[in-house]
Amino acid sequence: LPAQVAFTPYAPEPGSTCRLREYYDQTAQMCCSKCSPGQHAKVFCTKTSDTVCDSCEDSTYTQLWNWVPECLSCGSRCSSDQVETQACTREQNRICTCRPGWYCALSKQEGCRLCAPLRKCRPGFGVARPGTETSDVVCKPCAPGTFSNTTSSTDICRPHQICNVVAIPGNASMDAVCTSTSPTRSMAPGAVHLPQPVSTRSQHTQPTPEPSTAPSTSFLLPMGPSPPAEGSTGD
């Protein structure tokens, strides 16, 4: 004989568990329906009536199948140094991330506690390591034969153009200037950019200790304070 399909609420067989999207109600001692995401339990089940679900009110949500008496409150509005990357709906909480050009300097539990602007490397310095969601840009001096003439959190040092005849030699912050005859090889116009970090939520991971050339921070200096650092600037 085919097994009968039990409709909630029903008493489970001894030693068995309730089915998917059902829960065992201790008071009624029955398997009862859970409420779907976006809803909550308005009335709990009894031996004769199933769970009564109701939609979450504005600014509240449930993300999972549940039997909670009240929906969870969405988080506060995003701080002014953050942007809302996921709105508060009946089925999901609001998510705030650091605004473009910023990174999360301090993560706590679900989100970012403190956003900070990405360091900008000043002329003569280029990006050695791009910023990520949780780490700042690292600047480095442009090596001989390369330059950066911008104040930027994305531009790297790029090679000087090679001239048939040099009018003004290049330095760390300026490209070479050729005489009116065209250069043998010229770099493409415009600065070379590193991609900005994609703004999605991520776990706070500890970056590999690497000395920074920035004036605002460096990390793990067992011999004491660093010599004066250069190469970056504020906004």
């Epitope: 506060s76 706590k108 500890q206 970056p207 460096s218």
Partner: antibody, heavy 116, light 112 residues
């Protein structure tokens, strides 16, 4: 008990650099940030910057950004603040304090005098 | 930057009487995590600052219960129910909701 002990007073000439140290004890150094605050004679408190002792992430006041370097040495539970190109208006008592959500323990302060 | 405006800048009070200091921020101090990172510091003459109140109304350990903090959003108050001689000094409100952290200009509490 939690303590932050700072280095001693300094007298510097304009254009020089100064490094103030802040040795922490009584807690796990890497689980808190350190802020640096200064107070010019007879003036209020001025926030200079914050550094994470966990990963070195930091942020400093925009007006000081080109002149200040904050570092941490987790092996000795010490934070450092270096201020370069000193000017007479940098004369102040410099404080370190623990925290980011709130600043619960403070160093005793380090007087830096900039005078020619 | 968030500007913290304290009033009054000076407050002469009688011993045993209450005192109240107001602090207003130029924008809401409510963080997206739901917390409001507003603290009150006391600085006695010749001493470093000392934490009194954090997250608007939580009293730090060892702080007498005559100190209380209240407020929300952009308006905050520090109250001393009965001023004692040892309360003389400058009181600062400070926000650490976002960078740059900022302080009020301070309120000098003195005895009449």
């Amino acid at each position: 008990q939690v303590q932050l002990v700072q280095s001693g007073a300094e007298v510097k000439k304009p254009g020089a650099s100064v490094t103030v140290s802040c040795k922490a004890s009584g807690y796990t150094f890497s689980t808190y940030g350190i802020i640096w605050v200064r107070q010019a004679p007879g003036q209020g408190l001025e926030w200079m910057g914050w550094i994470s002792a966990f990963n070195g992430n930091a942020n400093s006041a925009q007006k000081l950004q080109d002149r200040v370097t904050m570092t941490t040495d987790t092996s000795t539970s010490t934070a450092y603040m270096e201020l370069r190109s000193l000017r007479s208006d940098d004369t102040a008592v410099y404080y370190c304090a623990r925290g980011e959500d709130f600043f619960d323990y403070w160093g005793q302060g380090t007087l830096v005098t900039v005078s020619s | 930057d968030i500007v913290m405006t304290q009033t009054p800048l000076s407050s002469p009070v009688t011993l045993g009487q209450p005192a109240s200091i107001s602090c207003r921020s130029s924008q809401s101090l409510v963080h997206s995590d739901g917390n409001t990172y507003l603290s009150w510091l006391q600085q006695r003459p010749g001493q470093p600052p000392r934490l009194l109140i954090y997250k608007v109304s939580s009293r730090f350990s060892g702080v007498p219960d005559r100190f209380s903090g209240s407020g929300a959003g952009t308006d905050f108050t520090l109250k001393i129910s009965r001023v004692e001689a040892e309360d003389v000094g400058v009181y600062y409100c400070t926000q650490s909701t976002q960078f740059p952290f900022t302080f009020g200009r301070g309120t000098k509490l003195e005895i009449k």
